[in-house]
Interface confidence: low
Amino acid sequence: WKFMGSKCSDSGIECDSSGTCISSSNWCDGVSHCPNGEDENRCVRLYGPNFILQVYSSQRKSWHPVCRDDWNENYARAACRDMGYKNSFYSSQGIVDNSGATSFMKLNTSAGNVDIYKKLYHSDACSSKAVVSLRCIACGVRSNLNRQSRIVGGQNALLGAWPWQVSLHVQNIHVCGGSIITPEWIVTAAHCVEKPLNSPWQWTAFVGTLRQSSMFYEKGHRVEKVISHPNYDSKTKNNDIALMKLHTPLTFNEVVKPVCLPNPGMMLEPEQHCWISGWGATQEKGKTSDVLNAAMVPLIEPRRCNNKYIYDGLITPAMICAGFLRGTVDSCQGDSGGPLVTLKNDVWWLIGDTSWGSGCAQANRPGVYGNVTVFTDWIYRQMRADD
């Protein structure tokens, strides 16, 4: 459950625009070394389930939490903007750091430069003994619902239970699911948008609705851009993730809300409970469901999922397995692109996007999902580039 490395060695990072490698000591040093300057705009990240703000230190060649001392909302907005959130900023607070960090990035308030990174310096002390926890968007929360909604082997969902769930239509037909991550951006699967379904004008997104039948009477949201992962492999389904940008931003409400993108350092447990949702078939070779269904599925460790009795080496680091090896509950045709979410620290996280499987709910053939943690860096880059 970690970032997948680039083609460069451990001491280097790859320039997306040119494919060349630069030394990690040149990364976030205030000087652009990549043709498009991307080595200077990937310098901030949120870490772990507490959203701890970390900044990359080119001196130490490592990530460090930002000390709460002298932090204010202007810096918070700048950090969110640098991550790719347009004008979005939700909350920033100091929290006690339980990670055992011994070095921090601190603000030099006397530095006149507006650039937040030029104001930060490396320090082994943090007088407030608190680090910055930063939320760029109010994500991963849902209406209070008591009933556990459960796809094959699932139950009908309640309105507002999965407020980030999107139904993606082509020609009035539900083709794939998706997940809201910002007012403008939806995560889905790359295999959903393979040619000939790669043109944004073909797609319409529906949100905040449980029934497919009622979508006929609603105006869906036009899609402005479709961005498929550049390394998606249609044969192996490796890197099966895509983004859709909506023509006009969504208005969030009780039944339309974003899910949180996972942060590095999430530390998911083997067999951690996750939930899948979608309008896919409720039995193998069945018809698309009219009503949204959801079900709990446990994560399956990659090593276990890759054994010869299950998927025999087909699972890459960009994939996650989840489900019951005895069958009974699984995602199915029509659920593709939809969310695999988990609850951690009272926040719902998008852990996977529904990708593939052998049949539906078959024994020893669990569902396979795109490992979203691997793709967060790519997602933020697309959001930043669009801005």
Partner: antibody, heavy 117, light 112 residues
Framework: QVQLQQPGAELVKPGASVKLSCKAS????????MHWVRQRPGQGLEWIGI????????NYNEKFKSKASLTVDKSSSTAYMQLSSLTSEDSAVYYC??????????WGQGTTLTVSS | DIVMSQSPSSLAVSAGEKVTMSCKSS????????????LAWYQQKPGQSPKLLIY???TRESGVPDRFTGSGSGTDFTLTISSVQAEDLAVYYC????????FGGGTKLEIK
């Protein structure tokens, strides 16, 4: 039953514009894409463009981008195609056709456009 | 752009004979996610608008006589009429919808 009604013929002068209509009935107009197709005398079929009546989303064949403009009037369930700067080359039969998934399941009878002075 | 080529451009057969016509695309029309070929066949009788015969390369539209059969995958497709009737006199067009929409030049079927 599904019907796409088009006027039989239009006669216009070179340099002028014309707005061709296609009135839909027998189905929910706003839930299906509408296409326009051209057929010159004795020639084959050429796809012009597509519009979604609900959202107004359009997409055009590059060849017709500066020639055709697609619109709809939801209240009358009518699709329109405006053709501008007409020349004799634009004389043809113009069909509207409903898209179901990715094929055209219903066609209008076509409007014969004659551009002549 | 995807180019669609039909052959022959015309053919004349007697009623009751079997007819095959070909349609080739400049790139594959098979979508791996749906496992469908995005190709349709249309029939246009003299003085009439086109009529859908076959979609997804081999699925016959409801109401179309079963003497019409579509086959093929990828880039090579065939429309077969098992026993031609006088009312089949028409031009037959193939159309791709894999990337926007392109029609083939048509095959004109005449009855001897």
């Amino acid at each position: 039953q599904v019907q796409l009604q088009q006027p039989g013929a239009e006669l216009v002068k070179p340099g002028a514009s014309v707005k061709l209509s296609c009135k839909a009935s027998g189905y929910s107009f706003t839930t299906y894409w509408m296409h326009w197709v051209r057929q010159r005398p004795g020639q084959g079929l050429e796809w012009i463009g597509i519009i979604h009546p609900n959202s107004g989303t359009t997409n055009y064949n590059e060849k017709f981008k500066s020639k055709a403009s697609l619109t709809v009037d939801k209240s009358s369930s009518t699709a329109y195609m405006q053709l501008s700067s007409l020349t004799s080359e634009d004389s043809a039969v113009y069909y509207c056709a409903r898209l179901l998934w990715d094929y055209f399941d219903y066609w209008g009878q076509g409007t014969t456009l004659t551009v002549s002075s | 752009d995807i180019v669609m080529s039909q052959s022959p451009s015309s053919l004349a057969v007697s009623a009751g004979e079997k007819v095959t016509m070909s349609c080739k695309s400049s790139q594959s029309l098979l979508n791996s996610r749906t496992r469908k070929n995005f190709l349709a066949w249309y029939q246009q009788k003299p003085g009439q608008s086109p009529k859908l015969l076959i979609y997804w390369a081999s699925t016959r539209e409801s109401g179309v006589p079963d003497r019409f059969t579509g086959s093929g995958s990828g880039t090579d497709f065939t429309l077969t009429i098992s026993s031609v009737q006088a009312e089949d006199l028409a031009v037959y067009y193939c159309k791709q919808s894999y990337n926007l929409y392109t029609f083939g030049g048509g095959t004109k079927l005449e009855i001897k």
